[in-house]
């Protein structure tokens, strides 16, 4: 079954390569187990950047190798992606799955365009 997912259209990463955005889903029922996946759509590719499963009220547990962290509050997930560089600029899509209890619901956001600007190197000091 389909579910609405909202996320910001544009986010600018910090000078340290960190981007944060909120992914909000309109839960049709009382889900106790939720899976959130961040997809990057760019360069003619789709990449699962990170994924987390959490029980409502608990902290997010991300899969291996994750460059993401996050927290949940109700039907909102606050996601942070770290270690970004200019070449990582792209459309980051939030995918939410309500895993339990049935029925299964799937929602995919329209994506957040994350812009990353590499900082200028500091000039040498004499």
């Amino acid at each position: 079954k389909a579910m609405h997912v909202a996320q910001p259209a544009v986010v600018l990463a910090s000078s340290r390569g960190i981007a944060s955005f909120v992914c909000e889903y309109a839960s049709p029922g009382k889900a106790t187990e939720v899976r959130v996946t961040v997809l990057r759509q760019a360069d003619s590719q789709v990449t699962e950047v990170c994924a987390a499963t959490y029980m409502m009220g608990n902290e997010l547990t991300f899969l291996d190798d994750s460059i993401c962290t996050g927290t949940s509050s109700g039907n909102q997930v606050n996601l942070t992606i770290q270690g970004l560089r200019a070449m990582d600029t792209g459309l980051y899509i939030c995918k939410v799955e309500l895993m339990y209890p049935p029925p299964y619901y799937l929602g995919i956001g329209n994506g957040t365009q994350i812009y990353v600007i590499d900082p200028e190197p500091c000039p040498d000091s004499d």
Partner: nanobody
Amino acid sequence: EVQLVESGGGVVQTGGSLRLSCAASGRTFSMYTMGWFRQAPGKDREFVAAISRSGGLKAYADSVLGRFTISRDNANEMAYLQMNSLNPEDTAVYYCAAAPVPWGTRPSHFTYDSWGQGTQVTVSS
């Protein structure tokens, strides 16, 4: 480096399926991000798919999304590429590759320092 050997290539009709396998040896397989690339005659090598070290995260080229599935079996040091709904544009030599790096946003650009010898896939119309 890890040694990689591909198998499973062959000739198949349009719309058919193949499953490519990549056997690894020599190093701890679970420390490597694994990728599949392909090279058609007269063209550059291109990214097909990649999978994270635990197998939980994946990436696909738009051209194969929904048709190809990458997977891995760390216990047996194997990587796989299930290819369905094949068409003549999929004809190429397919290479398995390993990158000793964690996951990120652009696995197609990882430094893959180990490559297999390739296996030929031919899709006839």
